[in-house]
């Protein structure tokens, strides 16, 4: 089969570029999945943890933060492939010798049952069924999140 070499037409404004959005998000943007009061975006390539963290920021989002076991289960239910691992926003802080979320808070030991060691250069990944400690240099997929702004009913003073 003889193929001609063609040039590709590609989007001028790539979706990886930062976009300006109004503060406060009422609905999930296109391509994002809503999970309760969050919007999630699953990557289609692989990266070490640091690169994943940086790539989420280009989408004006962060690596996934998981509040509790319930949210973990709901997130895992969105994962369709059994053997695939995803980085989330949790890594081991050597100075504090504890698991630390990227928002600065520490892991409540009851929230996630982590398989693997808590040690230097360890980051947390999740699969369809489990939570793992992996070397942060491991190249796997990742999940970004944006918080939805809750819509509150406006209260008007009596006139």
């Amino acid at each position: 089969q003889k193929s001609s070499i063609e040039k590709c037409s590609v989007d001028i404004q790539q979706s990886r570029n930062k976009t300006t959005e109004r503060p406060g998000l009422l609905n999930c943007p296109i391509y994002w999945q809503q999970l309760r009061e969050k919007c999630l975006l699953f990557s289609h390539t692989v990266n070490p943890w640091n690169n994943s963290l940086a790539d989420c920021s280009t989408k004006e989002s962060s690596l996934l933060l998981i509040r509790d076991k319930d949210e973990l289960i709901h997130t895992q239910n969105l994962i369709r492939d059994k053997a695939i691992l995803f980085w989330i926003g949790l890594n081991f802080s050597l100075s504090e010798k504890n698991w630390k979320w990227i928002n600065g808070s520490f892991l409540n030991s009851n929230d996630l049952e982590i398989r693997g060691d808590a040690k230097e250069n360890s980051c947390i990944s999740i699969s369809q069924t489990s939570v793992y400690s992996e070397y942060c240099s491991t190249e796997i997929r990742w999940i970004c999140q944006k918080e939805l702004t809750p819509v509150r009913n406006k209260v008007y003073p009596d006139s």
């Epitope: 590709c8 990557s43 692989v46 690169n51 190249e139």
Partner: antibody, heavy 120, light 107 residues
């Protein structure tokens, strides 16, 4: 202008290996994940795996996991796909294809294809 | 593995007529569906992503629709350059799979 140019046709014997190259131009090579897709004669398309040219990280279709190796040389903006222990049913056109977005699985640019014939 | 089934295998259409191509997924894939066009001796060319979003430079006569398991590519008025093979692909799972293709030929 974005372009992917692949190496020429190959004829191999069963059991041998083949290495196909894909040279990218017109964009930042390390900014987009490269995938490999093959098409057997008169058949549909089959996804083989991907490589992140920035880091060298790979993910392979389980079907090819034991036989395929994807690498890259960032200094010459080139991705490679090597398939070992070739069989007659590996006869196909092999395409490199650029992932258009880190968060969606579509291919917005394809190489012209490399025909690999496996015959004794 | 998600199986993508395209029908018909061959579609004979006259220039200027409408062509409707079908793609069915064996499981729900949401809207994570792509359509490509392939001409003889050429690589596939991206037409539509996310079931209905036309790629840059793709004429408005190409439109995609559907969600879940049933998807359609419509070419509203076939031009001579549209006679080709069309493939659908899903990326709802990380094992990307393609349909077997629909050949659109001149009637």
């Amino acid at each position: 202008q974005v372009q992917l140019v692949q190496s020429g046709a190959e004829v191999k014997k069963p059991g041998a290996s083949v290495k196909v190259s894909c040279k990218a131009s017109g964009y930042s090579f390390t900014g987009y994940t490269m995938n490999w897709v093959r098409q057997a004669p008169g058949q549909g398309l089959e996804w083989m795996g991907l490589i992140n040219p920035n880091t060298g990280g790979t993910y392979y279709n389980q079907k090819f996991k034991d036989r395929v190796t994807m690498t890259r040389d960032t200094s010459i903006s080139t991705a490679y796909m090597e398939l070992s222990r070739l069989r007659s049913d590996d006869t196909a056109v092999y395409y490199c294809a650029r992932l258009g977005d880190n968060y969606r699985g579509y291919f917005d640019c394809w190489g012209q294809g490399t025909t690999v014939t496996v015959s004794s | 593995e998600i199986v993508m089934t395209q029908s018909p295998a061959t579609l004979s259409v006259s220039p200027g007529e409408r062509a409707t191509l079908s793609c069915k997924a064996s499981q729900d894939v949401g809207t994570a569906v792509v359509w490509y066009q392939q001409k003889p001796g050429q690589a596939p060319r991206l037409l539509i992503d996310w079931a209905s979003i036309r790629h840059t430079g793709i004429p408005a006569r190409f439109s995609g629709s559907g969600s879940g398991t049933e998807f359609t590519l419509t070419i509203s008025s076939l031009q001579s350059e549209d006679f080709a093979v069309y493939y659908c692909q899903q990326y709802s799972t990380y094992l990307y799979t393609f349909g077997g293709g629909t050949k659109v030929e001149i009637k």
